[in-house]
């Protein structure tokens, strides 16, 4: 007992201040299990990682609430965190079925590229950045962003890394990323599309 | 409990088509992918292809277009795989398997059904 | 398609003893991989995803480690249930599987 509390608590101590805040929100339309009952949103948006942690046990007991912070996480496009969170809860444990993950709203945009529609996905699931990198170098990558993205450290931060770079591009630009992928991970896009 | 029952066993000529139904209870339905997987005897797991419940948008292994089709019935939480023109190649066992999330990951499978098995012969 | 070589067959083992079971991808597939036991007559179970988590109520001697294009599946301390067939599989891109390695008894 006591570690799936210490796995979220060390889970949302790692979230930035805004990536709390975006937490806390989703935490209020997250679907739950039938039988629990959602935090109230007055108490929850003004709690730091701490008390955060202990509502969320209280609430949903140490393995439904690790479960729910690691599907939460994952809707927020935070991959290796929510696969840590997972498994350090599961060292040993006899975890609980996995929940429901409800479907994100993804329909497509208008106006807004493949890219920019799914990013959250492609930070999670692109597995051979350097694929990509070795397709854009030259075109729309300087050699300094080809090695600013290489030197990070796991893919999720190589394709955050990518991605910072991304609001200086045009379409035509974005469609090179696109069709990279497509030779790349080609199942990957085919799924997104249809999502 | 998540349950994936599907139909039992096909006994078919070369040359027809034949539908497995896969019926799912336990979950909603519309929450998760359905994959469906061939075993030959003996032989390795091949991925034959998925399907969203939600808008019907299927994704094929290259190998099984035109082979294969996925649909879903989501009013009875039924996936169905129709193969045809069969030959004795098509001769296997056929899992119905439920992507375990989608969206932020790929497919893998955390529940499968017990099977179905299709023998062609004339 | 991403090819999963599992080079051992077959592999003789004891009761107690410490196994680890191999599989290579084709090219590099970051850790979207999963292992999944098949026991005679039965449907695969799933053991471990993203290469190392392991799945809900699996026993803590399965283990999975690996990235990029090596993966290995490890039983600490093996049992006579878990004789069975192994399955690697790769889901970075479309689905494929190894050609599974089976567990028997020396």
């Known amino acids: 007992m006591g570690r799936a509390r210490d796995a979220i608590l060390d889970a949302l101590e790692n979230l930035t201040a805004e990536e709390l805040k975006k937490f806390k929100l989703k935490l209020l339309s997250v679907p739950l299990r039938e039988g629990y009952g959602r935090i109230p949103r007055g108490a929850l948006l003004s709690m730091d990682a701490l008390d955060l942690t202990d509502k969320l046990v209280s609430f949903y007991l140490e393995t439904y609430g690790a479960e729910l912070t690691a599907n939460v996480l994952r809707d927020m496009g935070l991959q290796e965190m929510a696969g840590q969170l997972q498994a350090a809860t599961h060292q040993g444990s006899g975890a609980a079925p996995a929940g429901i993950q409800a479907p994100p709203q993804s329909a497509a945009k208008p106006g807004l590229h493949f890219i920019d529609q799914h990013r959250a996905a492609l930070i999670a699931r692109v597995t051979n950045v350097e694929w990509l990198l070795d397709a854009l170098y030259g075109k729309v990558l300087t050699d300094e962003q080809y090695q600013a993205v290489r030197a990070e450290p796991t893919n999720p931060s190589k394709m955050r890394k990518l991605f910072s770079f991304t609001p200086a591009w045009n379409w035509t630009c974005k469609d090179l990323l696109l069709q990279a992928l497509r030779e790349s991970q080609s199942y990957l896009v085919e799924d997104l599309e249809r999502s | 409990e998540v349950q994936l029952q599907e139909s039992g066993p096909e006994l078919v000529k070369p040359g027809s088509s034949v539908k497995i139904s896969c019926k799912a209870s336990?979950?909603?339905?519309?929450?998760?992918?359905m994959n469906w997987v061939k075993q030959s005897h003996g032989k390795s797991l091949e991925w034959i292809g998925d399907i969203n419940p939600n808008n019907g948008g299927s994704v094929y292994n290259q190998k099984f277009k035109g082979k294969a089709t996925l649909t879903v019935d989501k009013s009875s939480s039924t996936a169905y795989m129709e193969l045809r023109s069969l030959t004795s190649e098509d001769s296997a066992v056929y899992f119905c398997?439920?992507?375990?999330?989608?969206?932020?990951?790929?497919?893998?499978?955390?529940?499968w059904g017990q099977g179905t098995t299709l023998t062609v012969s004339s | 398609d991403i090819v999963m070589t599992q080079s051992q067959k077959f592999m003789s083992t004891s009761v107690g003893d410490r196994v680890s079971l191999t599989c290579k991808a084709s090219?590099?597939?970051?850790?979207?991989v999963a292992w999944y036991q098949q026991k005679p007559g039965q449907s695969p179970k799933l053991l471990i995803y993203?290469?190392?988590i392991r799945y809900t109520g699996v026993p803590d001697r399965f283990t999975g480690s690996g990235s990029g294009t090596d993966f290995t599946l490890t039983i600490s301390n093996m049992q006579s249930e878990d004789l069975a067939d192994y399955f690697c599989?790769?889901?970075?891109?479309?689905?494929?599987f190894g050609a599974g390695t089976k567990l028997e008894l020396k």
């Open positions: 398997a439920r992507r375990r999330a989608h969206y932020y990951d790929g497919p893998y499978f955390d529940y």
């Open positions: 090219q590099i597939v970051g850790t979207a």
């Open positions: 993203s290469a190392s």
């Open positions: 599989q790769q889901y970075s891109n479309y689905p494929t």
């Open positions: 336990g979950y909603t339905f519309a929450d998760h992918y």
